[in-house]
């Protein structure tokens, strides 16, 4: 499911509950995706020794994974709500191609990988509703994404395993930073 359970105000388990505010819904959505990433990381780490590998730099050269930097205004010092929100949305849009890459990388967690991808799309929609300055959000070029995907899929097995591990780790870090920043707003 792209949305965590219990989101609906008609939820029978909690009829007394008020509907979630947009902030609560976004917070819950991020946590739902992070739970999914946790499950995927578990499979990745059990399947290979990538999680302990020190050769990450080799694979990292091929990737341009979104990262939070000081200038993005998402950290406590120099915090800027609008700049940060733009960074979070832009970063999530940039992660989409990497989440697409993950789709055929899991055996027992295939549904989980799909759920992470779909939930991220929903999260982007939630955040776009919250953002005032949508013009500042740059959408990745589909042609560039398509060639990147082809390039990643053409890597040897070891690099593909390492890429999977790096994507999950970076996406987890990005979402954790986003969660903290959104709570700070």
């Amino acid at each position: 499911a792209p949305v965590p359970p219990g989101e609906d105000s008609k939820d029978v388990a909690a009829p007394h509950r008020q509907p979630l505010t947009s902030s609560e819904r976004i917070d819950k959505q991020i946590r739902y995706i992070l739970d999914g990433i946790s499950a995927l990381r578990k499979e990745t780490c059990n399947k290979s020794n990538m999680c302990e590998s020190s050769k990450e730099a080799l694979a990292e050269n091929n990737l341009n994974l979104p990262k939070m930097a000081e200038k993005d205004g998402c950290f406590q010092s120099g915090f800027n709500e609008e700049t940060c929100l733009v960074k979070i949305i832009t970063g999530l849009l940039e992660f989409e191609v990497y989440l697409e890459y993950l789709q055929n990388r899991f055996e027992s967690s295939e549904e989980q990988a799909r759920a992470v991808q779909m939930s991220t799309k929903v999260l982007i929609q939630f955040l776009q509703k919250k953002a005032k300055n949508l013009d500042a959000i740059t959408t990745p070029d589909p042609t560039t994404n398509a060639s990147l995907l082809t390039k990643l899929q053409a890597q040897n097995q070891w690099l593909q395993d390492m890429t999977t591990h790096l994507i999950l780790r970076s996406f987890k870090e990005f979402l954790q930073s986003s969660l903290r920043a959104l709570r700070q707003m």
């Epitope: 505010t21 819950k28 946590r31 406590q76 010092s77 903290r180 709570r183 700070q184 707003m185």
Partner: antibody, heavy 120, light 107 residues
Framework: DVQLVESGGGLVQPGGSRKLSCAAS????????MHWVRQAPEKGLEWVAY????????YYADTVKGRFTISRDNPKNTLFLQMTSLRSEDTAMYYC?????????????WGQGTSVTVSS | DIQMTQSPASLSASVGETVTITCRAS??????LAWYQQKQGKSPQLLVY???TLADGVPSRFSGSGSGTQYSLKINSLQPEDFGSYYC?????????FGGGTKLENK
């Protein structure tokens, strides 16, 4: 030195209202999320409400949702808790606390508390 | 909502002893956990955040550990100033619930 000073506590009748304040000093108030936490006599701590630095993010405990409103005035370095429809179970010491994002929202500074008694 | 179960509710120990307080969450809270100390008539003080990181100025005899749903606070070689109440708090899901507390008394 970071300082948080709560005020506004006192005796209130059931069904009544009260507004608590928390004056902050010694840090850039507008850069930090803030919490209200309460403690009933001889009981444990209960998280009440949270507000982000720019007031866009506001969260409440289910026990106070719809009755309490957290707000802040950044230029005046002040945090507020407007309490309405007060009940006897709201009797407690109310603390304001600073939320440190770098410390995963943990409360790194607390005020000395202000006591609220709901009784007829 | 995720519930926090803290144990024991009370604990008697002597100066020099080592004590451990545990908190169990009803779901994975991904290390989003803090520990606080509160002395009688005083405000709580932050001891540990992110489950394992000691807050500024906290003596090294305190240590936090755990992951997933199980967390603990260990105090090595108890000092007289360590007696009081201890609380864990989750920061993963909302509400940011506290554990029920542990009252640490001098034996």
């Amino acid at each position: 030195d970071v300082q948080l000073v709560e005020s506004g506590g006192g005796l209130v009748q059931p069904g009544g209202s009260r507004k608590l304040s928390c004056a902050a000093s010694g840090f850039t108030f507008s850069s930090f999320g803030m919490h209200w936490v309460r403690q009933a006599p001889e009981k444990g701590l209960e998280w009440v409400a949270y507000i982000g630095s720019g007031s866009s993010t506001v969260y409440y405990a289910d026990t106070v949702k719809g009755r309490f409103t957290i707000s802040r005035d950044n230029p005046k370095n002040t945090l507020f808790l407007q309490m309405t429809s007060l009940r006897s179970e709201d009797t407690a010491m109310y603390y304001c606390a600073r939320s440190e994002t770098a410390r995963a929202e943990a409360m790194d500074y607390w005020g000395q508390g202000t006591s609220v008694t709901v009784s007829s | 909502d995720i519930q926090m179960t803290q144990s024991p509710a009370s604990l008697s120990a002597s100066v020099g002893e080592t004590v451990t307080i545990t908190c169990r969450a009803s779901g994975n809270i991904h290390n989003y956990l803090a520990w606080y100390q509160q002395k009688q008539g005083k405000s709580p003080q932050l001891l540990v955040y992110n489950a394992k990181t000691l807050a500024d100025g906290v003596p090294s005899r305190f240590s936090g550990s755990g992951s997933g749903t199980q967390y603990s606070l260990k105090i090595n070689s108890l000092q007289p100033e360590d007696f009081g109440s201890y609380y864990c708090q989750l920061f993963w899901s909302i509400p940011w619930t506290f554990g029920g507390g542990t009252k640490l008394e001098n034996k």
